[in-house]
Amino acid sequence: TQNKALPENVKYGIVLDAGSSHTSLYIYKWPAEKENDTGVVHQVEECRVKGPGISKFVQKVDEIGIYLTDCMERAREVIPRSQHQETPVYLGATAGMRLLRMESEELADRVLDVVETSLSNYPFDFQGARIITGQEEGAYGWITINYLLGKFSQKTRWFSIVPYETNNQETFGALDLGGASTQVTFVPQNQTIESPDNALQFRLYGKDYNVYTHSFLCYGKDQALWQKLAKDIQVASNEILRDPCFHPGYKKVVNVSDLYKTPCTKRFEMTLPFQQFEIQGIGNYQQCHQSILELFNTSYCPYSQCAFNGIFLPPLQGDFGAFSAFYFVMKFLNLTSEKVSQEKVTEMMKKFCAQPWEEIKTSYAGVKEKYLSEYCFSGTYILSLLLQGYHFTADSWEHIHFIGKIQGSDAGWTLGYMLNLTNMIPAEQPLSTPLSHSTYV
């Protein structure tokens, strides 16, 4: 009987990230008796829901239940049945739903109502669905990466748990790129945060953090592309848009009604003499970069310094983890290596965008054409946003680490969100029980 394995004393939590382009379900696991320790929660599963983001179900809400089924059933399989009822489920919706709420609060509520009804039918402890704020999205992303990097631990390690981790206890900044918004969050060096809306105060594990955060709604990669198209079609002489952000030979028809569907293009909206136009790619990185820069208003700044659109941004400080679409796009382009300089990234983007569309399709035959066609724009947009938007330089580029996972857990806001809602990040440093952290007795 002595060799019989004791039942694992573990807990689980589920967070659904309802993003603008898709929904992902994450399952987290941790030892029950170590809830307040730093770094003990880890991701055991990610399930990507098939289909678009929940905001796209506005005219077909009855399909939401089926949409969520596969991943919720996967959660049923992964989590032991005996723990279903005590496993919390949280759904957080981000910028796609923020935009829908701007268009129609009633429609956004309806989508969330149906999501809640669907998720309530599962045997878990469903805690509700809500649209998280941009500030929360930034803050929880920052908490996630620093929790996983062990930055909140008071014990300085002599070893590094991940290749890009510095051994000091300075926190990493967080750079998050979604489809509809982008967040920048970091601890500035002895700098007053001049705008109260961008200031957060945390006390975590006995230490105070004054954190800067901002979420730029409409500046996620998908909405930025819609903005750019809406801006560029204003000056097109006919229904052909020669676009430097798409590969030479690429062609796509766009409905004007689709272009003006999002609140993000309202500022560029005008009556056009056609209902459709055709994008014709010309694949020129430099021109694409210039076109993207026109989305950033840098002419107005009521503070000592700004990012763009009059939004305060303190001087950049320390290392940054760039995740979500920052990582996915750069990974596809093979540009996530620590050794690739900003100049090299720019050179590779120039070459990539100039490649003919037919050649690109052949080289990446397994990739969906919709996604494949947009990597030139997305890569150029990332460079423009980081360099001109956030004022990274060729030197400070070395401090950006493109991160997919840390210790097997995805970088993103979901882990930080769950840690907060389950009260697993104490304000004070927990008293360590005797021997609990000892390597040798």
Epitope: D109, E116, T117, A129, R130
Partner: antibody, heavy 121, light 107 residues
Amino acid sequence: QVQLVQSGAEVKKPGASVKVSCKASGYTFKSYEMHWVRQAPGQGLEWMGRINPSVGSTWYAQKFQGRVTMTRDTSTSTVYMELSSLRSEDTAVYYCARGKREGGTEYLRKWGQGTLVTVSS
Amino acid sequence: EIVLTQSPGTLSLSPGERATLSCRASQSVASSYLAWYQQKPGQAPRLLIYGASNRHTGIPDRFSGSGSGTDFTLTISRLEPEDFAVYYCQQYHNAITFGGGTKVEIK
């Protein structure tokens, strides 16, 4: 469908307290704020305050502070409004009304049927 | 607190006519925080318009809202028999306040 069902009519003496209930169904109770509005006979609408059922936090109109208490029971999806030190001018129909989700705007989407409270010696 | 003044107090019109109801705020109100309700005798109020101009689900398109700042209007393009009722405007700015109401009665 969303339903808000209120408790029955009450007759109270001046100085007493009244507790009106509002049972919600057809939606996730914790996701929407609940408001209380009253209407004296032949008069207009008067907002009393609101409760966030998720955390139990409340916000009362200045006029009613110190006299009104709003509570909720998440196990039964019910909110309560208790008004103390009743006087004759508190005679009114009391309505519960479902408000916004977090981050939304304050308009009252769905109303209960109303509870008549009569204060008379 | 913001005071809402509705006018006229009573509007006497015939079915098929156009009704224009006014709501004036004592200080500027963000458009997203202005709503209109309809109340019939013995019934609870019913939301008609939110965000100054958005029709609530199921509300006929003869009802429309407009205005900004301190002046808001509810228009009923062609009065139907079931539209004769009391109409209230409501704002939110820290606290909710209602206007005194406009009674639309049959002439």
